[in-house]
Interface confidence: low
């Protein structure tokens, strides 16, 4: 039985410093019923940098409408890159509950950043 | 108005195989998660089968798991359910129903009646 | 798999009087419940969803409270069109999508 796919297309994003990044994340249901988050890095140490239910993230804005109920592109553009924000982003859907369990993740994209250029 | 029609019923023999079809109008097929949900007779409601807005994913009850294939064809805006190795106890009303965003039914068929008789 | 138990099996009422129904989940849903009414010979239809918020075109006699496990539907001075059978639904957690075994509130 094939299950929930998420898709993140790129494995690679290079964007000079300043600019924005946009990373790419489709899943392909809305079921199980539950938030998206990105985080960058994977394990204990992952910073979280959007769930879908909460926020604000001044920094981030989502690229489709996630709010539209049947909305399945949880594509996001992070502001004002610096190298700060290098590593690895991950698309993660989550399964509703008390908690929000993990449910699947994306393979990932490696964001770089590149110098400003002068 | 949404609209679901469902159609293929009838009696078969246990062991015998159906085709049930359900016309979708009124609203953009391809935006909505479809089910399928059955009622034998006098008896409550059972979901039988689940598949994403693109047809990428589906899901199946236990009790018919390996039986049946729920199916759709977003071109000609139609859901489909295949009953093989039917039993008598999968005798019932067969309705079609649109989930919302959050995988309840806000939309269902008037059904179509499955007989498994010998 | 989540088990849904209704209560009670039937409810014998006069119009005019309020029912209340309730739905008891065997896992915490948090307040992923649906309600849907069914008549004799008709496809159920939606009430309630989210616990508590009503269905486009649901008149506000019917009201649905609870999260977690325990769930209420009340249906207030009860009209002649009432009397039917109802479900709840969870889909907090799934597959598979469970129903109740539904609760019919007949005239007495």
């Known amino acids: 039985e094939e299950e929930l796919q998420i898709i993140q297309p790129d494995k690679s994003v290079s964007v000079a410093a300043g600019e924005s990044a946009i990373l790419h994340c489709t899943i392909t249901s809305l079921f199980p019923v539950g938030p998206i988050q990105w985080f960058r890095g994977a394990g204990p140490a992952r910073v979280l940098i959007y769930n879908q239910r909460q926020g604000p993230f001044p920094r981030v804005t989502t690229v489709s409408e996630t709010t539209k109920r049947e909305n399945m592109d949880f594509s996001i553009s992070i502001s004002n890159i610096t190298p700060a924000d290098a590593g690895t982003y991950y698309c993660i859907k989550f399964r509703k509950g008390s908690p929000d369990t993990e449910f699947k993740s994306g393979a990932g994209t490696e964001l770089s950043v590149r110098a400003k250029p002068s | 108005d949404v609209q679901l029609v469902e159609s293929g019923g009838g009696v078969v023999r246990p062991g015998e195989s159906l085709r049930l079809s359900c016309a979708a109008s009124g609203f953009t097929f391809s935006d909505h998660d479809m089910s399928w949900v059955r009622q034998g007779p006098g008896e409550g409601l059972e979901w039988v089968a689940g598949?994403?807005?693109?047809?990428?994913?589906?899901w199946y009850a236990d009790s018919v798991k390996g039986r049946f294939t729920i199916s759709r064809d977003n071109s000609k805006n139609t859901l489909y359910l295949r009953l093989f190795s039917l039993r008598t106890e999968d005798t019932a009303i067969y309705y079609c129903?649109?989930?919302?965003?959050?995988?309840?039914?806000?939309?269902w068929g008037l059904g179509t009646l499955v007989t498994v008789s010998s | 798999e989540i088990v849904l138990t209704q209560s009670p099996g039937t409810l014998s009422l006069s119009p005019g009087e309020t029912a209340t129904l309730s739905c008891r989940a065997s896992q915490n849903v948090r307040s992923n419940l649906a309600w849907y009414q069914q008549k004799p010979g008709q496809a159920p239809r939606l009430l309630i969803y989210d616990a508590s918020s009503r269905a486009t075109g649901i008149p506000d006699r019917f009201s649905g409270s609870g999260s977690g496990t325990d769930f209420t539907l009340t249906i207030s001075s009860l009209q002649s069109e009432d009397f039917a059978v109802y479900y709840c639904?969870?889909?907090?957690?799934?597959?598979?999508?469970?129903f109740g075994g539904g609760t019919k509130v007949e005239i007495k």
């Open positions: 639904q969870q889909y907090g957690n799934g597959p598979p999508l469970t």
């Open positions: 129903a649109r989930e919302s965003w959050n995988t309840f039914f806000d939309y």
């Open positions: 598949i994403s807005l693109r047809g990428g994913v589906t």
